[in-house]
Each structure stands twice: as C-alpha cells, then as structure tokens.
Interface confidence: medium
Amino acid sequence: LVPHLGDREKRDSVCPQGKYIHPQNNSICCTKCHKGTYLYNDCPGPGQDTDCRECESGSFTASENHLRHCLSCSKCRKEMGQVEISSCTVDRDTVCGCRKNQYRHYWSENLFQCFNCSLCLNGTVHLSCQEKQNTVCTCHAGFFLRENECVSCSNCKKSLECTKLCLPQIENVKGTEDSGTT
C-alpha cells in the first residue's frame, strides 16, 4: 500500500539527491545531468533517461545539474596580474592564480589582484608569504613597519604610530632641535 492523500491535503513534492522534479509533471523525478553536460530534454517518463548533452567549447558545468545551458568559462584578469593555472574544461572552470612569489589580495569575494610578496629588507620574515596573505615582517632596531615594509625611524613623525617603536631616535631628534633653538 502506497501512502496517499487527496490533492486538497497534499502540499507539494520534492525529489531526492541526484534528481529533480519534472517541470511539466510533478509526479516524476528525472535524473540530473552529470557535470560536463547540460539538460537538453527532460526525461519523458518514470525510469527513462534525461537527455543530457556535453558542454561546448568555452563552457562548463562543474556539478550535476538540470541547467538549460552550460556556464561560460571565466577569463583570468590580466589587469589584476592574474595568470591561468589551468584552462577551462567541460567540467571545470578556468583556474586563475598568481605568479611565484606573489600573493592574492581579494577586493571582493570573487575578485583578487596579484601583488609581490614583501622581502622584509631591514627586517626578518616572521611569517612566510602565503597564497592569500603577504609576508609578515619584523623590523630591525631603528626601523618601523609601514605598509609591510621596514622604514627607517628617521622617517617617523611624532603624529604617526611609529613613535613608540622609534622612541629613542625621536628623543635624539628632539634634543638636537632644542639645542639649535637656544
């Protein structure tokens, strides 16, 4: 006995994983198309195959689907310094990345720019450069960190955050200023 209720009480229907509800007949579940293919025609009836066709060049589907069209392949953003790591295939979008000794800075969820990793001149590497994070530098004495570069304390103005790090140097500069005014 298959459980059944009248249409009045029956709310709706939904298919299990790997299947989708037939758009014209909500009593049928059709098998989704494999990745690399798209939906050309819905399954004609229960147990019958969905008509799936392979994506054409320049397009892809990365997961099982019932899309009427494949998705267009992404293009790497040269103006952002991106390079192609792997080209688009029917079941995988283009993979873009950065060159060696560069890291990704994300401007938004899907947009990144490639920048050169800091070399930590006048300092030491605290954390190595990562795929999505610049090198973290620790500066030598007499230098302070500004925009991830070690800058000489002679460039430290009293109004900047560097005053604590460059305190001895600032006091010396202040002392010579005082002696010059007498």
């Epitope: 006995l1 459980p3 709310r11 229907s13 939904v14 509800i21 009593s27 049928i28």
Partner: nanobody
C-alpha cells in the same frame, strides 16, 4: 489515513542543537524510506536528508553533511533529525516526508515544525 506529525522545532542560537521528531501513522512505516524536507522563508523546497526503510543507508544534502544526523525507530514509527552546529541559514519549516519509489518525488504532509536560528 496517513499522518505525519513533526515536533521539536523552536528558537535556538547559532551553534546550538535541536532534535526533530516525526510520529508516523496510517501506513506501514517500516516499508518506506523516509526523509526531511525544508522550506526557508520566501524560498522553495529543499531536500535535506533521507534514510532507507531498514536504516542502513542515509543521505544528506551537502550543506548539512557532518552537522545533521537522520535516524529512525521502526518500533515506535518515528523519524528523527538531530541538528547540531546550527546556522542562520538552517532557519526553515522542516517537514517529514515519505519516499514512495525511485522515480517518484517525496510527498509530505502535516504542518511541519519551525526552526529559527538567531542570536
């Protein structure tokens, strides 16, 4: 008459847990795969999880895998959904569902139970 009565919903903070129950009657519970379907506010139906008649096979939608556990007690004609590490996006009305065959959709009845995940 087929009846599926869901319970156990409520308001819970993100990261919290809830256990939903579904008391079934009016059909031979042990003969059918069962599942949970949810509908978030203003959205369509989403298949969440499924369990075979003998409870030897379970399936989960990607977004709940590792957080939700479906189970059943055939002696009590009851289906369960243990929900851990709840997220705001899990907020929905959860319905108990009967799966009647490989090419048939889930069909669900009852009023459902509302799960709200909010701080």
């Amino acid at each position: 008459e087929v009846q599926l009565l869901e319970s156990g919903g409520g308001l819970v903070q993100p990261g919290g847990s809830l256990r939903l129950s579904c008391a079934a009657s009016g059909f031979t519970f042990v003969k059918y795969s069962m599942g949970w379907v949810r509908q978030a506010p203003g959205k369509g139906l989403e298949w969440v999880s499924q369990i075979s008649d003998t409870a030897d096979r379970t399936y989960y939608t990607h977004s709940v895998k590792g957080r939700f556990t479906i189970s059943r007690d055939n002696s009590k004609n009851t289906l369960y959904l243990q929900m851990n590490s709840l997220r705001a996006e899990d907020t929905a009305v959860y319905y108990c569902a009967i799966y009647t065959g490989r090419w048939a959709p889930f069909e669900y009845w009852g009023q459902g139970t509302l799960v709200t995940v909010s701080s």
